[in-house]
């Protein structure tokens, strides 16, 4: 398998919200038209597929409707954000690059991003 | 630059299925789409699927996503195609071609007559 | 996955030139920079004689040329020979792994 070089930060912090972003770099040995991108989360040496998008270069990318995550790409670049995080959801996420087409097929993995996920505190009740 | 060789021709009784095998040697197969094309007698080509071998994963045109089955063997650079429940109509020639962003290599094509 | 839409056939005389037009749509033809075509002669295996549009292989004549405009991708043969009777057939990437054919167009030489 043709080997390609991700890129992604090493820790982000979620929101109070539970809305994470991140940047995933990816070094095309060629034109790539059609890039397929997958979120993989690492938590106890076990991995599950958080959301996947494939899409077209300079078009958006699309998730499943019901999807966690969003997205757009500019160049090699695509940005991501999970959304709905919470305190469980603490864990490696791993962006995994793939060029589709044109061929050759290449593949691409990052060594992951650690997102922290704190669960706000609940408002304590107030006497008004 | 690969080159690609296709099994015998085959003649079948309606109702049952073929599966032709399309033999790479000399150049890259893991990394490559192979796409899988028919021709009816007298008629023109028809895209039905492709699989990159590496993935394994196929992708198959509407039309034909309920009969066909395509697979790749990287261990002996061999793709295949499966189509079951044939009809007279399926009576064609198969051929496995490699995709470089087009189809610049092509199997000899294989012939198989739907017959009862 | 229709196909796409080409001239059932197109004739001219030795020496003459022919142009066959593919019609798709914006998915295919249209959004597509991997539009290629092919000849066959009779109980031969297709070969490529443009791809990505209007790129030549090489051993290909440069009597042949490649062209698109918006869904319409067309193939120009100039300078018509005996040997380019045949049958020519364009093809398109379509996205997500999956290719459309054209219908084909026969050309004969008068």
């Known amino acids: 398998c043709k080997a390609m070089h991700v890129a992604q930060p090493a820790v982000v912090l979620a929101s109070s919200r539970g809305i994470a972003s991140f940047v995933c770099e990816y070094a095309s040995p060629g034109k790539a038209t059609e890039v397929r991108v997958t979120v993989l989360r690492q938590a106890d040496s076990q991995v599950t597929e958080v959301c996947a998008a494939t899409y077209m270069m300079g078009n958006e990318l699309t998730f499943l409707d019901d999807s966690i995550c969003t997205g757009t790409s500019s160049g090699n670049q695509v940005n991501l954000t999970i959304q709905g995080l919470r305190a469980m959801d603490t864990g490696l996420y791993i962006c995994k690059v793939e060029l589709m087409y044109p061929p050759p097929y290449y593949l691409g993995i990052g060594n992951g991003t650690q997102i922290y996920v704190i669960d706000p505190e609940p408002c304590p009740d107030s006497d008004f | 630059q690969v080159q690609l060789v296709q099994s015998g021709a085959e003649v079948k009784k309606p109702g049952s299925s073929v599966k032709v095998s399309c033999k790479a040697s000399?150049?890259?197969?893991?990394?490559?789409?192979i796409s899988w094309v028919r021709q009816a007698p007298g008629q023109g080509l028809e895209w039905m699927g492709g699989?990159?071998?590496?993935?394994?994963?196929?992708k198959y045109a509407q039309k034909f996503q309920d009969r066909v089955t395509i697979t790749a063997d990287e261990s002996t650079s061999t793709a295949y195609m499966e189509l079951s429940s044939l009809r007279s109509d399926d009576t064609a020639a198969y051929y496995c071609?490699?995709?470089?962003?087009?189809?610049?290599?092509w199997g000899q094509g294989t012939m198989v007559t739907v017959s009862s | 996955q229709s196909a796409l839409t080409q001239p059932r056939s197109v004739s001219g005389s030795p020496g003459q030139s022919v142009t066959i037009s593919c019609t798709g749509t914006?998915?295919?033809?249209?959004?597509?920079?991997?539009v290629s075509w092919y000849q066959q002669h009779p109980g031969k295996a297709p070969k490529l004689i443009i791809y990505?549009?209007?790129k030549r292989p090489s051993g290909v004549s440069d009597r042949f040329s490649g062209s698109k405009s918006g869904n319409t991708a067309s193939l120009r043969i100039s300078g018509l020979q005996a040997q380019d009777e045949a049958d020519y057939y364009c093809?398109?990437?379509?996205?997500?792994?999956?290719?459309?054919f054209g219908s084909g167009t026969e050309v004969t030489v008068l």
């Open positions: 699989i990159i071998p590496i993935l394994g994963t196929p």
């Open positions: 990505e549009v209007s």
């Open positions: 093809c398109s990437y379509a996205g997500s792994s999956t290719f459309v």
């Open positions: 071609a490699q995709d470089n962003g087009a189809f610049d290599t």
């Open positions: 000399g150049g890259t197969f893991s990394t490559y789409p």
């Open positions: 914006s998915s295919d033809v249209g959004g597509s920079d991997y």
